[in-house]
């Protein structure tokens, strides 16, 4: 067969759908590698078709759009499985063709099963809540184009494996779920099942995500640096090992990044001739708050390193901030035989 | 920004009000300080007000100056003022936020008081 | 109160040369100390904080060092745009702490040739 732009199986687009749920998948062509749409390849001639190739095995297969109840079709863009079977998971395809152009793209695409409180392998999308920030709503995702805007469908929302009614602060709202106090005991899995008719048949679709309490902004800090401070002297002697811990606290911020670093002299360590390590840790609080610690270590302190200025640094989409550790050269105790006999008059 | 004003000639002893009105930041967030520099002599500092409202001063102008804070402005008031006292009074704020090491990376222009009989 | 003197009180040099201005504190100050360049009629700006750290939008012409007692502002490759007075200064107090505490030194003034 003649050349085909050929993108690839495209891992980043892992698709997972629920088993005996429809499910509807749009070529990711005309969404992440293409210029232009379906409607203008249509109108340009050019026909869409879609292959796949079943699990654990090599072949690729036309799709059979000829099942009963067209349990799979496809409309535009769309390819429409009502509803899906565990044996549909594979490596779908879609490729646009005409006489002279051709371009195809792969995916992978698994149905996975969910037991009666919705667990499942679902890779499951967080949404984060402020806590304590007011009313705040979470919307039932991905269930646009399943059926038309003149079919009412119900909904029910569940927390874990409870439905969700006369809860102190967590109010169903069709669609959407509103959290009238967001608390730390709000986090967990909560899913919506969306169930509407077509063509005589009810159809379920059921949506987990997982709600995580984070910290407001309207308490949110520019970093707070807690270690160095002026309460601790970094006193060594020539030859000892100088350990300094940077240890900052940042709020949580939404899309924040989070940076520490040392400065030695006002030039980054890796700037400097002077054999240092930095070593990182970071630990987050519930409401996911962080603290990042970095250790400063020199080996075999000289007595010139000791005159240097060792400067803590933190960055976060709050502000800047820093701070010097307090670093000195151990006066060495006086020898007894000599010094202090001296001072006694010894000769 | 920082902004300082109120500024003027006044008589010795009587009491005298500055202002410094942020934009930009939070007062909650910095320390704000006040330094004074009187006619071809070198920098003073006077005092300093933390973001909690917690005040600093240099020992000499202890009693004899008074920082003071609302959301948005900082004043700075000389409680009895003498003829040493006239000088540029700026208005400042530290580099890094929260941070308790007062290095001042934001100045205003300065307001001239001047103490004469 | 700790004391900052400033040395000297005042130093020419050429434009393109080098100037080295001195600053010791009357304890130590670890590594506590800023530098600041005032043009007449204006604030003063900062240079360098903590010692030797540049201030954003500072040339690194200017190179702060030193530590403890002993500090030192230098500037190289002087531009006639450098003359000014030149002040250092400190935030911990006699015992080591910072809390909003300042002392200025006595300022020493750069004339460019």
């Known amino acids: 067969s003649e050349r085909c732009d050929d993108w690839g199986l495209d891992t980043m687009r892992q698709i997972q759908v629920f088993e005996d749920e429809p499910a509807r998948i749009k070529c990711p062509l005309f969404e992440h590698f293409l210029k232009f749409n379906y409607s203008t390849a249509h109108s340009a001639g050019l026909t869409l078709i879609w292959y796949w190739t079943r699990q654990d095995r090599d072949l690729e297969e036309p799709i059979n759009f000829r099942l009963p109840e067209n349990r799979i079709s496809k409309e535009k863009d769309v390819l429409w499985f009502r509803p899906t079977l565990l044996n549909d998971t594979g490596n779908y395809t879609c490729m646009l063709r005409n006489t002279t152009y051709c371009s195809k793209v792969a995916f992978p695409l698994e149905v996975v099963q969910k037991d009666s409180c919705f667990n499942s392998p679902m890779k499951l999308p967080v949404h984060k809540l402020y806590i304590e920030y007011g009313i705040q709503r979470i919307t039932c995702p991905n269930v646009d184009g399943y059926f038309p805007s003149s079919v009412k469908p119900t909904i029910t929302w569940y927390m874990g494996c409870y439905k969700i009614q006369n809860f102190n602060n967590v109010i169903p709202e069709g669609m959407n779920l509103s959290f009238l106090i967001a608390l730390i005991s709000n986090n967990g899995n909560y899913t919506c099942v969306v169930t509407y008719p077509e063509n005589g048949r009810t159809f379920h679709l059921t949506r987990t995500l997982t709600v995580k309490v984070v910290g407001s902004p309207k308490n949110a800090v520019p970093p707070v640096i807690h270690s160095p401070n002026d309460h601790v002297v970094y006193e060594k002697e020539p030859g000892e090992e100088l350990l300094i811990p940077c240890t900052v606290y940042f709020s949580f911020l939404m899309d924040s990044r989070n940076e520490v670093w040392w400065t030695i002299d006002g030039k980054k360590p890796d700037d400097i001739t002077i054999d240092v390590t930095i070593n990182e840790s970071i630990s987050h609080s519930r409401t996911e708050d962080e603290t990042r610690t970095q250790i400063l270590s020199i080996k075999k302190v000289t007595s010139e390193d000791l005159k240097r200025s060792y400067v803590c640094h933190a960055r976060s989409a709050k502000g800047e901030v820093a701070k010097a550790a307090k670093v000195k050269q151990k006066v060495p105790a006086p020898r007894y035989t000599v010094e202090l006999a001296c001072g006694f008059g010894a000769t | 920004s920082v902004e300082e004003s109120g500024g003027r000639l006044v008589t010795p002893g009587t009491p005298l009000t500055l202002t410094c009105t942020v934009s930009g930041f939070s007062l909650s967030d910095y320390y704000m300080g006040w330094v004074r520099q009187a006619p071809g002599k070198g920098l003073e500092w006077i005092g300093t007000i933390d973001g909690g409202g917690s005040t600093y001063y240099a020992s000499w102008a202890k009693g004899r100056f008074t920082v003071s804070k609302t959301s948005t402005t900082v004043d700075l008031t000389i409680t009895s003022p003498t003829t040493e006292d006239t000088a540029i009074y700026f208005c400042?704020?530290?580099?890094?936020?929260?941070?308790?090491?007062?290095?001042?990376?934001?100045w205003g222009q300065g307001t001239l008081v001047t103490v004469s009989s | 109160d700790v004391v900052m003197t400033q040395t000297p009180a005042s130093v020419e040099a050429a434009v393109g040369g080098t100037v080295t201005i001195m600053c010791q504190a009357s304890e130590t100050i670890y590594s506590g100390l800023a530098w600041y360049q005032q043009k007449p009629g204006q604030p003063p700006k900062l240079l360098i904080y903590?010692?030797?750290s540049l201030a954003s939008g500072v040339p690194s012409r200017f190179k702060g060092s030193g530590s403890g007692t002993e500090f030192t502002l230098t500037i190289s490759d002087l531009e006639s745009a450098d003359a000014a007075t030149y002040y250092c200064q400190t935030y911990y107090d006699s015992e080591g702490r910072s809390y909003g505490y300042n002392s200025f030194g006595g300022g020493t003034e750069v004339v460019v040739k």
């Open positions: 400042a704020r530290n580099y890094y936020a929260g941070l308790s090491d007062v290095f001042f990376g934001w």
């Open positions: 903590y010692t030797s």
